[in-house]
């Protein structure tokens, strides 16, 4: 595949990554799938600087990120190490709360109104952010 050197239309470039910010809501799995179909992934936050950038663009709205613990431990969707990586949880979070009545606990992470993270029920239809890295090989065939 060819190397992506600039961001697609309607995506925002920042620090050699491209970001797309939804304006409607989807369940986490649907949001994850949407990003994958765009040859991207749900946003992976690796620094305070990236956190502030994303926070600025999403505003005070619950928004999915690419972090979940649906299979046990917390994992970033791109394989970034969770334990040693950047974290920005709200106080007392994640708590895997079962009291919501939607079934099960809380296995997916989202940005809250103030940007800090909370774990929530994965089927809630929140907004989401897709991210893809520039300079990585895209899935599109090269232009001849």
């Amino acid at each position: 595949g060819s190397e992506r050197t600039c961001c697609p239309v309607n995506w925002v470039e920042h620090e050699r990554s491209c970001y797309w910010f939804s304006r409607s809501g989807k369940a986490w799995a649907d949001a994850d799938n949407y990003c994958r179909l765009e040859d991207a992934h749900l946003v992976v936050v690796t620094s305070w600087e990236e956190q502030k950038f994303v926070q600025h663009h999403i505003g005070p709205v619950n928004t999915w990120m690419g972090l979940h613990d649906q299979n046990g431990p917390w994992k970033w969707v791109d394989g970034t190490d969770y334990e040693t990586g950047f974290k920005n949880w709200r106080p007392e979070q994640p708590d895997d709360w079962y009291g919501h009545g939607l079934g099960g606990g809380e296995d997916c992470a989202h940005f809250t109104d103030d940007g800090r993270w909370n774990d929530d029920v994965c089927q809630r239809p929140y907004r989401w952010v897709c991210e893809t890295e520039l300079d990585k090989a895209s899935q599109e065939p090269p232009l001849l």
């Epitope: 304006r23 409607s24 809501g25 369940a27 649907d30 709205v61 619950n62 709200r90 007392e92 979070q93 994640p94 708590d95 709360w97 009291g99 919501h100 009545g101 939607l102 809380e106 989202h110 809250t112 109104d113 103030d114 800090r116 909370n118 774990d119 929530d120 089927q123 809630r124 239809p125 929140y126 907004r127």
Partner: antibody, heavy 121, light 112 residues
Framework: QVQLVESGGGVVQPGRSLRLSCAAS????????MHWVRQAPGKGLEWVAI????????YYADSVKGRFTISRDNSKNTLYLQMSSLRAEDTAVYYC??????????????WGQGALVTVSS | DIVMTQTPLSLSVTPGQPASISCKSS???????????LYWYLQKPGQPPQLLIY???NRFSGVPDRFSGSGSGTDFTLKISRVEAEDVGIYYC?????????FGQGTRVEIK
Amino acid sequence: QVQLVESGGGVVQPGRSLRLSCAASGFTFSSYGMHWVRQAPGKGLEWVAIIWYDGSYKYYADSVKGRFTISRDNSKNTLYLQMSSLRAEDTAVYYCARDAHDFWSGYFAYWGQGALVTVSS
Amino acid sequence: DIVMTQTPLSLSVTPGQPASISCKSSQSLLHGDGKTYLYWYLQKPGQPPQLLIYEVSNRFSGVPDRFSGSGSGTDFTLKISRVEAEDVGIYYCMQSIQIPWTFGQGTRVEIK
């Protein structure tokens, strides 16, 4: 502007079935979660059911679970409530209501005028 | 289920005077996302309910500023600073932190 219009109400005998419809207009129906809320004559409000924007998830009050089914047809901009094994205590005005936002909001900002369902022999 | 308890159940107010309604929940309505999922609705005679206040203290679009909401955790209050004739009806608090969503019994407000 947002409009929700319920239909299908009427008098029905105990044990029988009835289907309510809610025709939506003035917004992108397929982007919003929808609810049914009911109010027995002279009584308070009771939440009945919710359906996700795409119909993927549905939740019900215990009082109607197993008897009522919420559904939607996004191509027709219509919400439904199929009610079976009706009881006298299901007599109420049934309102359809729309989520406040096209993402999880936790409340409804728009309501229909309601459809009266009377269960009586 | 979360039980919502309103007091008083009935209120008779002189026009221009303040009014206050209390709502208590059987569990905290503070969610892990930092929001408190408590709402106030007014149902005027012969009409469907209308949203007044969302997330404890935010006035919905078009709601007069004489309406205000406050509280936290399990104790909440709706205040009308100066009651007008058009404010008559039944006021309901509602929680949506847990399914099933539940309402208070309602507080009937009438004009003296």
